[in-house]
Every structure is written in C-alpha cells, then in structure tokens.
C-alpha cells in the first residue's frame, strides 16, 4: 500500500513570495506523484513546479494559486493511487488601484452644497486599512464636513464646499504591506467669489519688429482684478510701463499689446487674476523672439540612372520650427511622383540623366529663409576614346599606354599589369586623362597591360600588349678593372643582348691582335697561363646589324696572389705585459696589412700610447689588460685581392708562486714575457 | 480476484455516438487509475484516456473534445462516452487498471 | 511524446531457440517506466515484464527484460509452443498517457 510520510498542510502565503506544498510517500514498488488543484492535473511552469514529490512556487499568485491542491502518488503497476489530504494557501496580499468618484455619476454633476463619495480603489487580504489625503495632508476620522467608511473604502463630503477642492489620495496599509492609490482624483469646486480662468494666454513666437498679443480673462462674483507682470515683477499698466516695454498697452478685456517687439521684451508674462475671496491664479506665457539659423552645407551627390536614393535637408535650428521644401530649377518639388519631397527628404526615383543638376532646400519661419544648394551628379557609364594599343617601347626611354575615356562624373582609371594593379611610384605614373607612362622602359615590362575606367554607374576595360625593343648592352657590364693571378689560368666574361644575338670580340686596346696563347671564344678571353705581358687596355665589342657596335673597355692587371708568410698565434700574455701579434704578407702588387681587433678596424692615427702597428705588419700592444682579450684579424689586401687570418689573445692575472715550485718552473701555458 | 467486465460495443455511423462500460470488481475501485486502450485490426495497442481516483482525466489528442471518460466509484464502473465517431475510431477496445488487469475487450465498428 | 521502435518486425524461430526482441526509444525512459507484452489473436494483451527487468506474477522464468536508457531487451531463453505471439513493448511515465512499440510478431520457422 502507498502511504504518505508528508502531507501537504493549508498554509498563510504572500503574494509574489515563495512556498512550498510538502509531500512524501512509502510504497512497495515505484510510483509517479503529481498534483492537483481543484481536481486538474498541475503542469509544471518556471513559477510552479514539482521538486522532488513537493510542489514549489517560486511565486504565489492570489489567482493561479487559489484552490484546494492534492498530492497523489500512483503505482502504475497496479494502478492504485493514494491521495493526501487537501491543502490550500491564504495567500496576503494588497493591490493599488485608483480614487474614482462614486457620487455623484460624474464630475459635471458636481456643485457647491452636494454630497461628494470618492471611493479608493486599494484591494486587499486581509481586508486593509485605508487612510485619505488631501494635497498630501491626511484626513482624520471625524474631522467637519467629511466621513470616512473603511468598509466601503468610501471619503463622504457632506456638503462638498470650495474649501474641499484639492487632490485626493488614499493610502493603505495591512499585515502584507502598503499601497497608495495609482491615480489620484482632482476636486474643484468653484466659488463663485473666487477668480475663475476664461482665457489663458498662450506662448508667442514673434519676429524682430512685429506686434505681439497675450489675451487673458478671468470671471468672478464681484468682477475680479486683473495684472500684467514681466519677468522681474515689474507691473504692466497703462500709466505706469517699465523702460524696456513703453510700447505695451493693456485693454479693458485684459489682453495685452507689445508693438515693435525687440530681444529685451522676450521673457515670460504673467498674467494674474484675483477674486475678492481665494487664492490668486498665476498664468503665465513666453514671448519668443523668431530666429533661424544657418544650414550645413551638402557635399555634391553622385547617383547612378535607375537608382532610387534619398537626399535628407536638415532644418537649421530655429523658432519656430522652420518649414522645409526643395525646389529644382526654381521650381517647388511636389509631394509625389519621380522626383518629389517626402518630409524633409528628397526623393528621386528611377534616377534619369536628365535629373543631373543642383537642387535647392530652403528652410524659413517668422526670423527669415535660408537656402542650401546640392549639386547632383547622374553618373553614366565610362565610353572610349581612345583604347590601349598593342606597343612596341623602346627599353631605357618613356613608354605610353593610352586610355582615353569620357563619362560623368570624370571617370577614374586604373591599370593592371599582369592582373596585378599598378601602384604609382617612379617608374609608372598615371595621368589625369589616364594615361599610363612607363619612365624607364625595362625588358621584364613586355607583357600585358589592362586599363578600366569606372564611374558609380559602371566601368568599362581594354588591354593590349607591350613588346620592349631591347637595346644593344652588356649584360652585365665588364668590370672595368680586373686581376688575373701570374702564371694561372684566366678568363674575363663579356655578353650582351640586343634587339638581334649580337656578335662579341676582345681586342686590345691598342689594335695589336690577342696572342695565341689567349683565345677569344664566344666573347669569353681565356688566358691558358698569365704572363707579366697580358696585363694592358683589352677592349669588348658587341655588334648586330639594326643596333651597331657597343664598347667596353677593361683595364687587366697581373698580380700575384696574397700569401702569408707570418701569421699570427694563439697568444696568452699577463696582465700589465707587452703583447706581440706577428703578421707578414706577401704579394704583387705589395699588400698592405690593416688590423681588426673585437670588431672594429685598428687605425693606426688613431691607435693611442699602447699599441703600434709595425712595417712589417706586426702589432704590438703594451700594458695589456683584460679588456684586450679578444680576437685579433690581420687583413692583407692589394688592388687585386685580399686576404685575412685570425688569432685570440687572451689576458691573465699573473700567478702568486707556490713554495714547491721553483722560479725556473715555465707556465701552463704559451706565454709571451717581456 | 480482480475482474474487469466490459460492455456497449457495437456498431455506428460516422459522427454517431456510443457509451463504452466496464464493471470492476475484487478491490477498492475507487481508489485506482483506470483507463481505456484500444487495437484497430491488424495494429498496434493505442492509449485512449485515463481517469485518476479523484477524478482527474487525461486524453490523447486524437480523441479530445469527442471522448469523455468518467467513473462511478459506488457502482464501480468506469465509463468511456465516444460522440462524433470517425471510421479511423473502429477498433476493439479495452478498459484497464494499472498495467495487469485488461477487460476482455469490446469491438467498436464505424461504418456508413 | 516518446516513440517506442521495436525490431524486428517480424522474427521466425523454432522452439527451443532463444528470442531476442528490441526496443528503442526516442529519448530517454526511465528504467522503472517501461513493460512488455504479449497478445494472443483474440486476447487482451498480458503483462510480462514492467519496470524494464521485473517479471509480473505468474511469469515463467525464460522470460526476461534488460536495458536502460533509450535501448531496451525482452529475450526468451528456450521457446515453447505457446510462445508464439505479438509482443509490444510501453512506457509509462509521470502522466498516465501511455505509448506503445509497434509490435514484434514471433513466427514458428
């Protein structure tokens, strides 16, 4: 059998605050729980759900939760259910709501000397207690002329006077919380003494120079008084009027003229009526004085034919608001149609060539009229005049590609080399008309050049190829000076290109011919072996029929080779000694030695009291300190070749002697004593 | 020995009406679920509605707003009120409680 | 709603061979919540198994129920004669709106 270990109770609960209906049961088997409530199966919500077999309520709701809610457990097996005992919530709450006449049907019904019920609309449970105010005043119980029924939520005034007139609220109060009435309610109850508005003066926007009219009228029992004020109290009358307002005239119905107006008359006027009983009414009204600023100006527009696009006039600041209209060829644009003016926008719809032009916003109110011109462009598809031709540049001069187009507005041009877009920079350049100018023709800019020229409304290509006519060179120049080693095979290239292969040969310079041992083959000279006599002027020369001959001319010189005949070794000197590093070169022509030590090339007008580089090349560093350690490059080098060879130099602290070894005993180590 | 009687089959017009019955007897009706499945020929088993002790009730879509289940607790019978019947409603149908105890079944025909 | 599959459709056996009969279900069914059945031609169904491996009283012991999840078993160990039948397998959740499998028949080879 199912048995309930927990079952859920009747239980007081706030409205909008949490709770929970407990259940719990024992059964042989597994059984579903679920709820009910007022016998309907309970669905689970995000504010209502089962927690476990309980049922939570993130928030009780007075309506969705008013009932009697059951738990039963179910062994679907079998199909016997238990069902607990029923529970329901005595759920607190309060809720705000209006003060609403309850009496007389409505507020026209109202009169001096009659009953009034106003009733507050703040509901609750348990029952509240309500409490009236009276301009924020509270009303007690009791008090003259009014009752109070907190069962009937009602405020009787019996009889309502003018002295009841003023806002009523309630407020009210239980074990849940508070409310205040949501909308309150606006006794008037006229006294016939008291001064009553008939006409109240409106705000004015005048322009600079024109006349202004406040009216204003009062009715009372006797007739009430009637006064103008401006903003510093100054009293407006007919006999007595301030500095700044001499042309102001009251009239006998109250409204009140200012002629001429000028900025020191814009403020506030009021305008105050008095009854022989009652407060004094206060109405006030602005004098603004009309001003219109300036209007931004437009950038020019550039639409494309059978478009539809919008152009927005924004109205210069100013009082009143200035009105907005366009006009085009002087012409006011209608409120429909093609082209036509939608708010403050002008509208062209499947934009033509013929809408091309300038149209105008104009802008005005009371202060004047201000205008905007915005020039508008339909763009048309670029169309040839002339077309990039197929070239032949010439390489080493200027080269142009032509790419003449027409369109509006003035189409931009592109080229592209290769696919590849060209960016300006010193070797091409494109001109206005679109012109593509190559400064320095190379052979590498044979290839294929495309031109586009677009406007917004489209754009149209052409390509054609260039062909570069090469011009006869060296490729590359023969250095002009070079070595030949003595006694060692040679050879000194020499090749060039041209429009046709051209055909090359090695002279001498003085016309001699080559001797035999040196051979010309294909423009490369091969010295077999290098005597004393091959050095000399050797002339290289290029031919081809259309282009003629090039020359160049290569000074040879026959050198022996750099060999060192002393190099420098690995040398460890101590401290504070002389440091010697020997390095002898020989050569033809007789190389001459420079040092590098620790990076840096050692000048010898520069090198100090320490070191010395000598004749014979070798240097010496004296007082060595530790900061000389390093590695030191004897760099040999004549007109024909050079040649370098390096050592370390280390510097140590000198040694403190130990008893058993003898003075005579040598140093781990090379070591160079001085 | 727990029994389960069934009766009111028979044979109907689309959109008539039929009330099915079943008697339960051998333990404490008013304290179990109770609900009808029924079998069109040749198909599967299709739940129909199910009515709780306490009176709750539950319904497939197919059947809503045309079916009513209710129940007699002191004559121990369960009741299934079919109106508006369709030709797609003929099948044998069963009265059941818990998942061991099925009625002997009565047939339902639609038929014009 | 769950939907119950059960494969195959039809399965022919000889008695003394073991069945073994599939339910797959759409999403998740607590183990507790489902049951198998068997129907005879002109019969009510009859409880076999409920709470995926419990046999209901009177319910030989070559019969039993296994799996979890999405994936549930009814195998019959050693078939009799009398084992020939339509099988469907139901789930039975927190409402009381059952489902049903489609059936398995179980065929004499």
């Known amino acids: 059998a199912i048995v309930f270990i927990k079952q859920p109770s009747s239980q007081d609960a706030l409205q909008g605050r949490r709770a929970l209906l407990r259940c719990e049961v024992e059964a042989p088997g597994p059984v579903h729980v679920y709820w009910l409530l007022d016998g309907a199966p309970v669905q689970d919500t995000e504010r209502r759900f089962a927690q476990g077999s309980s049922l939570s309520f993130a928030a009780v709701d007075r309506l969705q939760d008013s009932g009697t809610f059951q738990c039963v457990a179910r062994d679907d097996v079998t199909g016997e259910e238990a069902r607990s005992a029923n529970a329901s919530f005595n759920i607190k709450w309060i809720e705000a709501g209006p003060v609403v006449l309850k009496h007389p049907a409505s507020e026209a019904e109202i009169q001096p000397q009659t009953q009034v019920t106003l009733r507050c609309h703040i509901d609750g449970h348990p029952r509240p207690t309500y409490q009236w105010f009276r301009d924020g005043t509270p009303l007690s119980d009791g008090q003259s002329n009014h009752t109070v029924s907190s069962k009937e939520r009602n405020l009787t005034l019996r009889p309502a006077g003018p002295e009841h007139s003023g806002l009523y609220s309630c407020c009210a109060h239980s074990a849940f919380g508070q409310a205040c009435s949501s909308q309150n309610f606006t006794l008037s109850i006229a006294d016939e003494s008291f001064a009553r508005v008939v006409l109240a003066p409106q705000d004015v926007v005048v322009a600079r120079y024109e006349e202004a009219m406040f009216h204003c009228q009062f009715s009372a029992q006797p007739p009430p008084s009637l006064q103008w004020l401006f903003e510093d109290e100054t009293p407006i009358t007919n006999r007595s009027r301030p500095p700044h307002l001499r042309r102001a005239t009251v009239f006998a119905n109250g409204s009140l003229l200012l002629t001429q107006v000028r900025p020191r008359n814009a403020g506030i006027y009021r305008c105050i009526g008095q009854g022989q009983r009652g407060p004094p009414i206060i109405l006030e009204a602005t004098l603004h004085l009309a001003e219109i600023e300036d209007m931004p100006l437009f950038e020019p527009r550039v639409f494309t034919a059978g478009s539809e696009e919008r152009v927005t006039c924004l109205p210069p600041k100013g009082l009143p608001e200035p009105s907005v209209w366009w006009e085009h060829a002087g012409v006011r644009l209608p409120t429909h149609g093609r082209v036509y003016q939608k708010g403050h926008e002008l509208v062209l719809a499947n934009i033509a060539e013929s809408d091309a032009g300038v149209y105008t916003c104009h802008a005005a109110n009371l202060a004047g009229q201000r205008r905007q011109d915005v020039n508008i462009t339909v763009a048309t598809v670029p169309s040839w005049l002339k077309k990039p031709q197929d070239s032949q540049l010439e390489e080493g001069k200027p080269g142009y590609l032509d790419c003449l187009t027409q369109a509006t507005p003035k189409p931009t041009v592109v080229w592209y080399r290769n696919q590849m877009l060209i960016s300006e920079d010193s070797r091409f350049e494109v001109f206005k008309n679109g012109t593509l100018r190559i400064n320095s023709v190379e052979v590498y800019d044979g290839t294929w050049y495309r031109c586009m020229s677009s406007t917004p409304a489209g754009s149209i290509e052409a390509q054609a190829r260039v062909q570069v006519l090469e011009k006869l060179k060296f490729t590359p120049p023969p250095q002009p000076q070079q070595c030949m080693e003595f006694d060692k095979e040679a050879t000194v290239p020499c090749s060039a290109t041209g429009r046709e292969k051209p055909t090359i040969k090695w002279e001498r310079a003085d016309g001699s011919s080559l001797p035999e041992w040196v051979t010309d083959n294909a423009g490369t000279l091969h010295f077999a072996r290098v005597t004393r006599d091959d050095a000399g002027n050797y002339t290289c020369i290029a031919s081809n029929g259309p282009q003629g001959q090039i020359r160049a001319h290569v000074q040879l010189t026959v050198a022996v080779f750099i060999t060192f005949k002393v190099e420098p070794e690995r040398t460890t000197v101590y401290q504070g000694h002389t440091a010697l590093l020997q390095c002898e070169a020989q050569g033809d022509p007789k190389p001459l030695i420079q040092w590098k030590g620790k990076d840096r090339i050692l000048d010898p007008t520069k090198l100090g009291p320490r070191m010395h580089i000598f004749q014979n090349g070798s240097l010496v560093i004296h007082d060595v300190a530790p900061e000389d350690s390093g590695r030191y490059t004897c760099i040999a080098g004549n007109s024909c070749n050079i040649k370098h060879t390096e050592a370390p130099l280390y510097v140590v602290d000198k040694p403190v002697p130990e008893e058993s070894e003898g003075p005579g005993s040598p140093p781990p180590y090379k070591m160079i004593q001085t | 020995e727990v029994q389960l009687v069934q009766s009111g089959g028979g044979l109907v017009h689309p959109g008539g009406s039929l009330r099915l019955s079943c008697a339960g007897s051998?333990?404490?009706?008013?304290?179990?679920?109770m609900y009808w499945v029924r079998q069109a020929p040749g198909k599967t088993l299709e739940w129909v509605s199910a009515i709780g002790s306490g009176g709750d009730t539950y319904y497939a879509d197919s059947v809503k707003g045309r079916f009513t289940i209710s129940r007699d607790n002191a004559k121990n019978s369960l009741y299934l009120q079919m109106n508006s019947l369709r030709a797609e409603d003929m099948a044998v149908y069963y009265c059941?409680?818990?998942?061991?105890?099925w009625g002997q079944g009565t047939l339902v025909t639609v038929s014009s | 709603e769950i939907v119950l599959t059960q494969s195959p459709g039809t399965l022919s056996l000889s008695p003394g061979e073991r069945a073994t009969l599939s339910c797959r279900a759409s999403q998740s069914v607590s183990s507790s919540y489902l049951a198998w059945y068997q129907q005879k031609p002109g019969q009510a169904p009859r409880l076999l198994i409920y709470g995926a491996s419990s046999r209901a009283t009177g319910i030989p012991d070559r019969f039993s129920g296994s799996g979890s999840g999405t994936d549930f078993t009814l195998t019959i160990s050693r078939l009799e004669p009398e084992d020939f039948a339509v099988y469907y397998c139901?789930?039975?959740?927190?409402?009381?709106?059952?489902?049903f499998g489609q059936g398995t028949k179980l065929e004499i080879k």
């Open positions: 059941a409680r818990g998942l061991g105890y």
């Open positions: 051998g333990f404490t009706f008013s304290t179990y679920l």
């Open positions: 139901q789930q039975y959740g927190s409402s009381p709106m059952y489902t």
